[in-house]
Interface confidence: low
């Protein structure tokens, strides 16, 4: 048993919709008689090894859980003692205990149940940024950008919506772009503008609301 060791964090926390990289090193005895390749899998605690599929595996012949397919990835190569796990589009129901299993046909089959990974997926607490370049001048077009710099590139791209109940310059109430181009009018001053960002991979939406400050150039008439 001493030769079977796994070094990984005991606990990892990630916010829903985001990604996390779990570094992991795995050690197993080097038996010369075992000629088969080393394959590794991450499994959720409590599953039957014979009935349930893993959440991620390096074995191309093995199926993985539908719920984690495409989201959980065994990044590391177990043959190189690397069992690193990458999770994208984290979902609340991913929360749980996970363990690593190594297989080397025909003799080696070992589950590292003494070194389990506790994964906690918490509510998304971050909000988008709304970036306004300079001042909003009545009658002049402006580009507003809704930004989520904390989102991970490997995740499902988020969708953007812009909402306002009183923005007279918007031809429609929503647009699916992270950049909103509009020409503010004097009557838009003080209205609220909301950017909604939906992470469809996790089914979660966050938003940021600002109050528009529309200025008039000197010489413009007040209504």
């Amino acid at each position: 048993d001493l030769e079977f060791q796994l070094v990984a964090p005991e606990s990892v926390t990630v916010e829903e919709g985001l990604c996390v990289h779990v570094p992991c090193s795995v050690f197993y005895p080097s038996i010369k008689l075992t000629l088969g390749p080393v394959t590794g899998s991450w499994l959720r605690k409590g599953v039957s090894l014979h009935e349930d599929s893993p959440v991620a595996t390096s074995d191309p012949r093995q199926l993985v859980q539908k719920a984690t397919q495409g989201r959980f990835q065994l990044l590391g190569d177990p043959q190189k003692h690397d069992c690193s796990l990458f999770i994208r589009d984290a979902q609340k129901n991913d929360t749980g205990m996970y363990f690593f299993r190594v297989v080397r046909e025909p003799f080696v089959r070992y589950s590292y149940k003494k070194s389990q990974l506790s994964l906690h997926v918490t509510s998304l607490s971050r909000t988008p940024d709304i970036i306004i370049p300079g001042t909003l001048e009545a009658g002049y077009p402006s580009n507003l950008t809704c930004s989520v710099p904390w989102a991970c590139e490997q995740g499902t791209p988020p969708t953007f919506s812009w909402m306002s109940t009183a923005l007279t310059s918007l031809s429609s109430r929503t647009t699916d772009s992270s950049v909103l181009t509009f020409t503010p009018q004097p009557q838009d001053h003080g209205t609220k503008l909301t950017c909604l960002v939906t992470f469809s991979g996790a089914g979660v939406t966050v938003e940021r609301t600002i109050q528009l400050n529309v200025t008039r150039k000197s010489g413009q008439m007040r209504e």
């Epitope: 919506s161 909604l196 996790a202 979660v204 939406t205 938003e207």
Partner: nanobody, 120 residues
């Protein structure tokens, strides 16, 4: 001024079903929406909530029996209640969150409540 109109409450036998509706007038845009309930002599508690993207959350005691849904185009919120029990008897309120703040405090809109009585 935003006004919420709730409907669908009433008297139902244990094991029966009801569908509550909450319609918002006044043109507000709703980001998150939720149903709360308050039983006689008890504090108001969250029953279920739903985000604009459709992500839902349920109190443990109603999970599997109640379903929250919304129609963004109609600014309407619904609560389908199945397998009702006597302990579900309460005044049910809808709460809409337009994602706005007033003096740095979140602004919520509450309905006037609709009574649900589960009794044989």
């Amino acid at each position: 001024q935003v006004q919420l109109v709730e409907s669908g409450g009433g008297l139902v036998q244990p094991g029966g079903s009801l569908r509550l509706s909450c319609a918002a007038s006044g043109g507000t845009f709703v980001i998150n929406a939720a149903w709360y309930r308050q039983a006689p002599g008890k504090q108001r508690e969250l029953v279920a909530s739903i985000s604009y993207g459709g992500s839902t959350n349920y109190a443990d005691r109603v999970a599997g029996r109640f379903t929250i849904s919304r129609d963004n185009a109609k600014n309407s919120l619904y609560l389908q209640m199945n397998s009702l029990r006597a302990e579900d008897t309460a005044v049910y309120y809808c709460r809409l969150d337009p994602g706005l703040a007033l003096n740095n405090r979140p602004l919520y809109y509450w309905g006037q409540g609709t009574m649900v009585t589960v009794s044989s």
